[in-house]
């Protein structure tokens, strides 16, 4: 019962997480204009992974897609890639986990197969969550770098032609949605992996096996010893899992570069 609950909860948490990752990826507010000196603005800029928008005080909003692919910063491309990989892995994980759910009966699928599928989906969710967290973190790092760069060059001219106040951008809502969603997907994945251990059929090995020694007839019951030490042929049916431990290095952010009213 606890295993089913853990698996079900892991699925639901991952589902919410992946929905959040998709939402974050589609959102326009990855970076929003920093209102450092003017909290009420007549023109407000914000940017997403796919387009940039300008909202006027009049209420009109104009969004323009990034129609170039080669002209975009490499870091933005990397963030896009990480988020898409996260979504794809998460979607596959969801598909796999649906069939792995203990409460769903599909033909004569054995528990061992369900356990394998649960583990697979769990790992997929973990990697999906890490991709999302990494993507959002890279973008955030990019913003921080640019924020201080634009602060240093606050009143630089554009090629000496036009004196323009450089727009500074700060964290948008999508970053927080992405971090939370990535975290939820990660937690859901860990829960699936934990559930997998409970789903795995553990051989009891308490059937008496007769070994005929020369001149003697002695019955041994070796299951407990073999199960605990890992010796013997029965170990192939024993699921050994490390709990999906991962190092913090997989979520490191990288130095980057990126760009109110």
């Amino acid at each position: 019962m606890a295993v089913t609950a853990c698996q079900g909860l892991g699925f639901v948490v991952s589902l919410i997480g992946i929905a959040g990752i998709i939402a974050a990826t589609c959102m326009d507010q990855w970076s929003t204009q920093d209102l450092y000196n003017n909290p009420v603005t007549a023109v407000f800029n914000y940017q997403g992974l796919w387009r940039s928008c300008v909202r006027e005080s009049s209420g009109f909003t104009e969004c323009r897609g990034y129609f170039t692919l080669l002209g975009l910063p490499a870091m933005l491309q990397a963030v896009r890639a990480l988020m898409i990989v996260g979504i794809v892995l998460g979607a596959i994980g969801l598909l796999v986990s649906i069939f792995a759910l203990k409460c769903i009966r599909i033909g004569s699928m054995e528990d061992s197969a369900k356990a394998n599928m649960t583990l697979t989906s769990g790992i997929m969710f973990i990697v999906s969550g890490l991709c999302a967290i990494a993507g959002v973190s890279v973008f955030a790092n990019m913003l921080v770098t640019n924020f201080w760069m634009s602060t240093a060059n606050m009143y630089t001219g554009m090629g000496g032609m036009v004196q323009t106040v450089q727009t500074r951008y700060t964290f948008g809502a999508a970053l927080f949605v992405g971090w939370v969603a990535g975290g939820l997907t990660l937690i859901g994945g860990v829960m699936m992996c934990i559930a997998c251990r409970g789903l795995a059929p553990e051989e009891t090995n308490y059937k008496a096996v007769s070994y005929h020694a020369s001149g003697h007839s002695v019955a041994y019951k070796p299951g407990g010893f073999k199960a605990s030490t890992g010796f013997g042929s029965n170990t192939k049916n024993k699921k050994i899992y490390d709990g999906g431990a991962r190092t913090e290095d997989e979520v490191q952010s990288y130095p980057s570069k990126h760009d109110y009213v």
Partner: antibody, heavy 118, light 113 residues
């Protein structure tokens, strides 16, 4: 067609308050911000503030803040500007104007003359 | 606050001639998000409310004659009336629509020589 009809002229004593109305018609009232502009006799234009009829959010010129209050009545598509603690320099024509693309004012009311005199 | 400075204060031009009004802002009105200049031009005739001519520095409002054109970017802007007509006698104002408080220039009075 878009129309902004303002209330009639007002004569007030110093220290009093005045409430000018601006009734909008011919467009979706909540879809456009409404602004108020002051024009003193023989002078230029001065922005007072604006109100978002959808959310009710307001922005004011610091010069008028504390003395001016912008309100709306969605049921009658009317915007109100109340100016308190009137002084002689408040004598002017007050216009309401609809905000358009580029934050420009595309339609204006006919203006309301407010005279402050003792 | 952004200060808008118009020049000249008044302008006398012969009918059919070109009239040029300048407007300078104390800060750039160019928005980096959409590369548009948030500057508007209005025409005001005596006893009437102002009338919108040009927004985004160079976009003519529908119905405005094409003899009116706006140009400039950043801090320096120009309103040009290519061939002055009698009905163009008015006061012309530029406005900062980029940053609150929204501010107007002092106005330029256009007359017929």
């Amino acid at each position: 067609q878009v129309q902004l009809v303002q209330s009639g002229a007002e004569v007030k004593k110093p220290g009093a308050s005045v409430k000018v109305s601006c009734k909008a018609s011919g467009y979706s009232f909540t879809g456009y911000n409404m602004n108020w502009v002051k024009q003193a006799p023989g002078q230029g234009l001065e922005w007072i503030g604006n109100i978002d009829p959808y959310y009710g959010g307001t922005s004011y010129n610091q010069k008028f803040k504390g003395r001016v209050t912008l309100t709306i009545d969605k049921s009658t598509s009317t915007v109100y500007m109340e100016l308190s603690s009137l002084r002689s320099e408040d004598t002017a024509v007050y216009y309401c104007a609809r905000m358009y693309h580029g934050n420009a004012f595309d339609y204006w009311g006919q203006g309301t003359t407010v005279t402050v005199s003792s | 606050d952004i200060v808008m400075t118009q020049s000249p204060d008044s302008l006398a031009v012969s009918l059919g001639e070109r009239a040029t009004i300048n407007c300078k802002s104390s800060q750039s009105l160019l928005n980096s998000g959409n590369l548009k200049n948030y500057l508007t031009w209005y025409q005001q005739k005596p006893g009437q409310p102002p009338k919108l001519l040009i927004y985004w520095a160079s976009t003519r409002k529908s119905g405005v004659p094409d003899r009116f054109s706006g140009s400039g970017s950043g801090t320096d802007f120009t309103l040009t009336i290519s061939s002055l007509q009698a009905e163009d006698v008015a006061v012309y104002y530029c406005q900062n629509d980029y940053s609150y408080p929204l501010t107007f220039g002092g106005g330029t009075k256009v007359e017929i020589k």
